[in-house]
Amino acid sequence: SGVFQLQLQEFINERGVLASGRPCEPGCRTFFRVCLKHFQAVVSPGPCTFGTVSTPVLGTNSFAVRDDSSGGGRNPLQLPFNFTWPGTFSLIIEAWHAPGDDLRPEALPPDALISKIAIQGSLAVGQNWLLDEQTSTLTRLRYSYRVICSDNYYGDNCSRLCKKRNDHFGHYVCQPDGNLSCLPGWTGEYCQQPICLSGCHEQNGYCSKPAECLCRPGWQGRLCNECIPHNGCRHGTCSTPWQCTCDEGWGGLFCDQDLNYCTHHSPCKNGATCSNSGQRSYTCTCRPGYTGVDCELELSECDSNPCRNGGSCKDQEDGYHCLCPPGYYGLHCEHSTLSCADSPCFNGGSCRERNQGANYACECPPNFTGSNCEKKVDRCTSNPCANGGQCLNRGPSRMCRCRPGFTGTYCELHVSDCARNPCAHGGTCHDLENGLMCTCPAGFSGRRCEVRTSIDACASSPCFNRATCYTDLSTDTFVCNCPYGFVGSRCEFPVGLPPSFPW
């Protein structure tokens, strides 16, 4: 669709005569008829296939034509067409004399024609005017013409329809050739796809308007590139949504079981060495001079009764010192100047001569030891208590004070963690070396089956058209991540293309 425009500029008829040679009385009141038709090698009469237009009387004899409306007519003259411009044309311009006000052909005398010109040729669509001048024996006509496209039509032939828009169906303006030029922030064949925030993750993010990044379920962050771990995940991470991959030193479904108590809590005191021995379980190896489960108690060096033969021990800053009884000497009073005659054996020990009476040895009754039977037996020296139990001397016997979770004479027995039925909702309890584990029935989870969980909403494959299904644990629902070209809560609808254009 377009318009052929003809601009009449000047008509010269100095003698004021008709084509027949007869003069006009009083002068030639001149109007024009224009016929636009398809290209003819020889322009001949016949239908004006591209259109016709007439002017009012524009002047008498010789006159210039103004560029605007003149007496109700328009200059340039408009010859609209509703087809593809063919690039060639034929044009007939007739100048007529109007004796009266009625300009209809049937109202004019047959010899009212002043002049007639006919041209033909090629004409491309464009903004530039082509100037022409046609001269006959008695008249001269100067004019210019061009073809331009109607609004919203573009291209070499005015055949491409393009109407700028900024709505749901597209966001674009039109280029001179009729191609779409997307508005900033939009892309796609019809400029319907927003360009998301720069860096927005292709799969995990999307946008409904330019420069935004909306996250699909299970993802977060400015660019939707950080997954959200399983709800309840404490010391874990994820690489896909709702995972819970435990950090080092943590275990369990929610990574909330401490497998590295030593590092996380540093329970051993006074430079002791800590060894992990299971969930929340550890053993401290004390440095010399310290004791207790956490090596929190300072030992006196005299506590080990280093002085023999009844020697008394004195603590010193750099160790200890033995004060020996009469008849004994040495660092620990271990050397004797006595014989059996001096009755050196205490606590009912019996004396035996050695080396022809130069020395002796004491045979001690039960519960006593030492070269002179002077020491009560410390039944805790062999560390008989297992699992970190504390050994206590009780007269002639000993006993073990056990840590929580252990029992038995030597703390060698685990207390059954399952005895108190810790698993909720009918969970099955299993005793483990370092604690317990619950096997939960369907619909429950958690360390003690205390969390009611939904059945996997994606199990029924609710998404169509190869969409990816995510279970949103926070709402017990599924969400479908649609591939390009599909919409709907289950990706069941293909995206409708916008109304088709004429090209």
Epitope: L197, A211, C213, L214, Q220, G221, E226, N231
Partner: nanobody, 123 residues
């Protein structure tokens, strides 16, 4: 049930300070990015600040940059907003929320919301 409960709002003079808190429950707080959003009377919601799940990355709207500080304590399931050098234009209801969509300047779509706490800056 997810709950976000804001507190710490009140009336303060221009130039004064307030510290807002948001206590979270019903979800694993430490796994989620968090945000503060405010809504002044007769206006739409305006993003104020955001912080990532670990607390290492913080974001601020231009209007509060240098005056407000966002922080979180994942052990206490609590989000904070320290507001200094307050101005009358900071008067609004302040909400904490979990962002699920970002624009060029900050979050603009949210999942969970609190009920809000009123902050009034007036002499």
């Amino acid at each position: 049930e997810v709950q976000l409960v804001e507190s710490g709002g009140g009336l303060v003079q221009p130039g004064g300070s307030l510290r807002l808190s948001c206590a979270a429950s019903g979800f694993t707080f430490g796994n989620y990015d968090m945000s503060w959003v405010r809504q002044a009377p007769g206006k739409g919601p305006e993003w104020v600040s955001a912080i990532n799940s670990g607390g290492g990355d913080t974001y601020y709207a231009d209007s509060v940059k240098g005056r407000f500080t966002i922080s979180r304590d994942n052990a206490k399931n609590t989000l904070y907003l320290q507001m200094n050098s307050l101005k009358p234009e900071d008067t609004a209801v302040y909400y904490c929320a979990t962002p699920r969509g970002w624009g060029p300047t900050g979050p603009h779509e949210y999942g969970y919301w609190g009920q809000g706490t009123q902050v009034t800056v007036s002499s």
